[in-house]
């Protein structure tokens, strides 16, 4: 007599790409179209993700792995597995509820995504501003004012000249 509880789980023999149910004729069956199972012994297959609208397909669904999405041009991924697409802005802007807005004075954004960040405060490191910041670029900090005092050289000595016909080793 075959009993309902077996010592070995029959589902353990079902590979990825199948589902298992010992109440059916065929204990292991292939996942139906547009579904997948990424591990063996699964009781059901998962519905494939569909990349629609602002999402586009980066990798098609297979019987053993889900589809992967990215975003259409003008948008970028947010969240684990690109769960959301967010509108791109220009460099020097950030996305607000009202759309893309220029960075306020004293802040910058050098990417098409994310928020405007404050310029680096060079004086906190005892340095001076070498290149001013813009909406798109952070300031460039230079040597501290003390490094530029008389008698202190801020010029790097030139590298020794090479003999002609020799290449660096």
């Amino acid at each position: 007599f075959e009993r309902t509880r077996s010592l070995q789980d029959p589902c353990s023999n079902c590979p990825a790409g199948t589902f298992c149910d010992n109440n059916r004729n065929q204990i292991c069956s292939p996942c139906p179209p547009n579904s997948f199972s990424s591990a063996g012994g699964q009781r059901t297959c998962d519905i494939c993700r569909q990349c629609k609208g602002v999402f586009r397909t980066r990798k098609e669904c297979s019987s053993t792995s889900n589809a992967e999405c990215d975003c259409t041009p003008g948008f970028h991924c947010l969240g684990a597995g690109c769960s959301m697409c967010e509108q791109d802005c220009k460099q020097g802007q950030e996305l607000t509820k009202k759309g893309c807005k220029d960075c306020c004075f004293g802040t910058f954004n050098d990417q098409k995504r994310g928020i405007c960040r404050p310029w680096t405060n060079c004086s906190l490191d005892g340095k001076s501003v070498l290149v001013n910041g813009t909406k798109e670029r952070d300031v460039v900090c230079g040597p501290s004012p003390a490094d530029l005092s008389p008698g202190a050289s801020s010029v790097t000595p030139p590298a020794p000249a090479r003999e002609p016909g020799h290449s660096p080793q």
Epitope: N25, S29, C45
Partner: antibody
């Protein structure tokens, strides 16, 4: 459409045997396992087990102690249930049911026979 | 075995909303089905996979829940809904049914 048609009611005495049948139509019989369900008068449904209609292998619940046999007449798309050494507590309606699992949800009984009443009385 | 517990009886008036509960002694994931049985008839599938409406079943019926607590809702109830409602789990062996909830329409 899919139909499961069961044999008619049976009146038996204790100690006798009964064999009831369930004829399937409207689908490929050997594609789906056939399950049997018991319903004593005024009581809940109780799963008895299943028969694999492709291999003929039966599976019984633990408390069916050898008096119950599931069998097939696959050429006639028919599943059968035989109960031997009948007891009063076997008085019940017996249903056959086609089990379905589409892969993305768990299984269910999609189709049922109309039921066969077996009365055991001396 | 997984025991499914249902309240034995409910009485409601036509047009009202009714909920039938089913509690499991251990998790059955979403492998929970609901059947309607009228006197002298075989059970009829209403809901499969806890929340999916079987084809041909009126949208007045809906199911919810996962794990150990499940609900069948009928809104609005009609006179024709007088029947016994059974839940069934297909997650654990052996498959089990609830004891049934008899719905009476006042």
């Amino acid at each position: 459409q899919i139909q499961l048609v069961q044999s008619g009611p049976e009146l038996k005495k204790p100690g006798e045997s009964v064999k009831i049948s369930c004829k399937a139509s409207g689908y490929t019989f050997t594609d789906y396992a056939m399950h049997w369900v018991k319903q004593a008068p005024g009581k809940a449904l109780k799963w008895m087990g299943l028969i694999n209609t492709y291999t003929g292998k039966p599976t019984y619940v633990d408390d069916l102690k050898g008096r119950f046999v599931f069998s097939l007449e696959a050429s006639a798309s028919t599943a059968k249930l035989q109960i031997s050494n009948l007891k009063n507590e076997d008085t019940a309606i017996y249903f056959c049911a086609r089990y379905y699992h589409d892969g993305t949800y768990y299984g269910w009984f999609a189709n049922w026979g109309q039921g066969t009443l077996v009365t055991v009385s001396s | 075995d997984t025991v499914l517990t249902q309240s034995p009886a409910l009485a409601v008036s036509p047009g009202e909303r009714v909920t039938v509960s089913c509690g499991a002694t251990e998790s059955v994931s979403t492998a929970l089905n609901w059947y309607q049985q009228k006197p002298g008839q075989q059970p009829r599938l209403l809901i499969y996979g806890a929340s999916n409406l079987e084809s041909g079943v009126p949208a007045r019926f809906s199911g919810s829940g996962s794990g150990t607590d499940f609900t069948l809702s009928i809104d609005p109830v009609e006179a024709d809904d007088t029947a016994t409602y059974f839940c069934q789990q297909t997650w654990n062996d052996p498959l089990t049914f609830g004891s049934g909830t008899k719905l009476e329409i006042k």
